[in-house]
C-alpha cells in the first residue's frame, strides 16, 4: 500500500467536482486537499459519492479540524452528516437555525438517529432554552420530539413556544410530561375566549388538575371521549356526575362503552349509584343508596 500514498501525476484535485467520483479511496485521500474540501463543501452534496468515498472526505475534515468543524463547514455537510458520530457532533458549536434545518433535512423521513439527537441537544443547550422557532423546526421534522424530552428538559420550554405545538406532537407524551406542559399551555392561551381556548388547550388536558376540569364543565365545551380518557385519574375522581355530564355534553353517552376502562371505571366506583342512574346510560358499580362514604385521605390529612 505504500506506493499509493502519493497522488498520481495529473490527478491533484483543483476543485470539488464530478470527476472525483471515479477516484479510488486512496486517490481521494492523496489528491484532495482538506482546505479545498472545506471551502467547497457545498458542492459535495450534489456529487454522487458513495458512502465509502464520503468516509475518506470525513477523515480529511477530521484532520483539518481536530477540535470540531466550524459552522461554515457544518452547514454544508449534507449527506456527510450521516457519517458523523455523536462524539464528532459533541465538538461542534451550532448556533444557526439554518444549519440545524439543513442537517435535519438530510435525515428527513427517517427515525431520529443518535447523531440527530446529539445535534439537537447541542443546539438547544447552546441557545439556553427551547424557543418557538426551534420548537417549530424540530416538531416539523419529528412530531414526537417534545415527548422524547424529560420533564426537567420540558421545564425550559417558555410558554410562548407552546403556540408551535400541534395536537399530534403530544400523542406519545406521558402524564408526567403533560403535567409540565399543561401549566405552560394554560398561561400561553389565557387571553383566548372560551371555545377557542378549549380547542387550543384540549391536547394538553392530560396534565390538568380537578379545579380546571370543574371550570371547563361550566363552559359548554363538549369534550370528546378520547380527550376524557386521557385525563389524569386523580383529577377526574372528584368530579360529580353533573360536572362530567356538563363537561362531555352530547358525548356523555360514550361513558357506557368505556365503563370498564380507567379513568371511567375508577370514577364510577366513586359516584352514588342514584346519581349515575340520572344519566340513563345503565352505568353500574356506583355506591349503593344508603351507604356512607368516608374520605379517608381527608381524614389522614387532618390527623
Amino acid at each position: 500500500e505504500v506506493e499509493k500514498t502519493a497522488c498520481p501525476s495529473g490527478k491533484k484535485a483543483r476543485e470539488i467536482d464530478e470527476s472525483l467520483i471515479f477516484y479510488k479511496k486512496w486517490e481521494l485521500e492523496a489528491c484532495v486537499d482538506a482546505a479545498l474540501l472545506a471551502t467547497q463543501m457545498d458542492r459535495v452534496n450534489a456529487i454522487p459519492f458513495t458512502y465509502e468515498q464520503l468516509d475518506v472526505l470525513k477523515h480529511k475534515l477530521d484532520e483539518l479540524y481536530p477540535q470540531g468543524y466550524p459552522e461554515s463547514v457544518i452547514q454544508h455537510l449534507g449527506y456527510l452528516f450521516l457519517k458523523m458520530s455523536p462524539e464528532d457532533i459533541r465538538k461542534w458549536n451550532v448556533t444557526s437555525l439554518e444549519t440545524l434545518k439543513a442537517l435535519l433535512e438530510v435525515n428527513k423521513g427517517h427515525e431520529m438517529s443518535p447523531q440527530v439527537a446529539t445535534l439537537i441537544d447541542r443546539f438547544v443547550k447552546g441557545r439556553g432554552q427551547l424557543d418557538k422557532d426551534t420548537l417549530d423546526t424540530l416538531t416539523a421534522f419529528y412530531p414526537g420530539y417534545l415527548c422524547s424530552l424529560s420533564p426537567e428538559e420540558l421545564s425550559s420550554v417558555p410558554p410562548s413556544s407552546i403556540w408551535a405545538v400541534r395536537p399530534q406532537d403530544l400523542d406519545t407524551c406521558d402524564p408526567r410530561q403533560l403535567d409540565v406542559l399543561y401549566p405552560k399551555a394554560r398561561l400561553a392561551f389565557q387571553n383566548m375566549n372560551g371555545s377557542e381556548y378549549f380547542v387550543k388547550i384540549q391536547s394538553f388536558l392530560g396534565g390538568a388538575p380537578t379545579e380546571d376540569l370543574k371550570a371547563l364543565s361550566q363552559q359548554n365545551v363538549s369534550m370528546d371521549l378520547a380527550t376524557f380518557m386521557k385525563l389524569r385519574t386523580d383529577a377526574v375522581l372528584p368530579l360529580t356526575v353533573a360536572e362530567v355530564q356538563k363537561l362531555l355534553g352530547p358525548h356523555v353517552e360514550g361513558l357506557k362503552a368505556e365503563e370498564r376502562h380507567r379513568p371511567v371505571r375508577d370514577w364510577i366506583l366513586r359516584q352514588r349509584q342514584d346519581d349515575l342512574d340520572t344519566l340513563g346510560l345503565g352505568l353500574q358499580g356506583g355506591i349503593p343508596n344508603g351507604y356512607l362514604v368516608l374520605d379517608l385521605s381527608m381524614q389522614e390529612a387532618l390527623s
Epitope: P48, F49, T50, Y51, E52, Y79, L82, K83, H110, S113
Partner: nanobody, 115 residues
C-alpha cells in the same frame, strides 16, 4: 436494508454486447444513487458508472461511449448495456446502491470477454 441481485453476465466474444441487470428490493425509497463497479482478476475494484435518482449519468473514461447505465423505476431495476466489449472488460461486475446511510452491494455477476 436494500437487497441487490445482479444477472446477465456470461461468456461473450470481443466486439459483442451484453446487458446486465440489477434488481433492487427492500427499502428502495432510501436509495440516493446507484452504480456499477467491476473487479478484474488480481485487481482492485473500480468504478464504472453511476446514475442518480433524477437520471443524471456518470461514466469512467474507459467505458465512455461503449457502456450505458439506465434504470427502470417501475421495476426497481438498474441496467448496464455493454457494447463493443474488449478482453480487458473481463471482470466480476457489481451493482451498488448508495442508500441512507450506507452503500449496499450485490454479489456480482461474471462477464468473460474471450474468443
Amino acid at each position: 436494508e436494500v437487497q441487490l441481485v445482479e444477472s446477465g453476465g456470461g461468456l461473450i466474444q470481443p466486439g459483442g454486447s451484453l446487458r446486465l441487470s440489477c434488481a433492487a428490493s427492500g427499502n428502495i425509497g432510501s436509495i440516493r444513487h446507484m452504480g456499477w463497479h467491476r473487479q478484474a482478476p488480481g485487481k482492485e475494484r473500480e468504478w464504472v458508472a453511476t446514475i442518480t435518482t433524477v437520471g443524471t449519468t456518470y461514466y469512467a473514461n474507459f467505458v465512455k461511449g461503449r457502456f450505458t447505465i439506465s434504470r427502470d423505476n417501475s421495476k426497481n431495476t438498474l441496467y448496464l448495456q455493454m457494447n463493443s466489449l474488449r478482453a480487458e472488460d473481463t471482470a466480476v461486475y457489481y451493482c451498488r446502491a448508495t442508500a441512507h446511510p450506507t452503500d449496499y452491494w450485490g454479489q456480482g455477476t461474471l462477464v468473460t470477454v474471450s474468443s
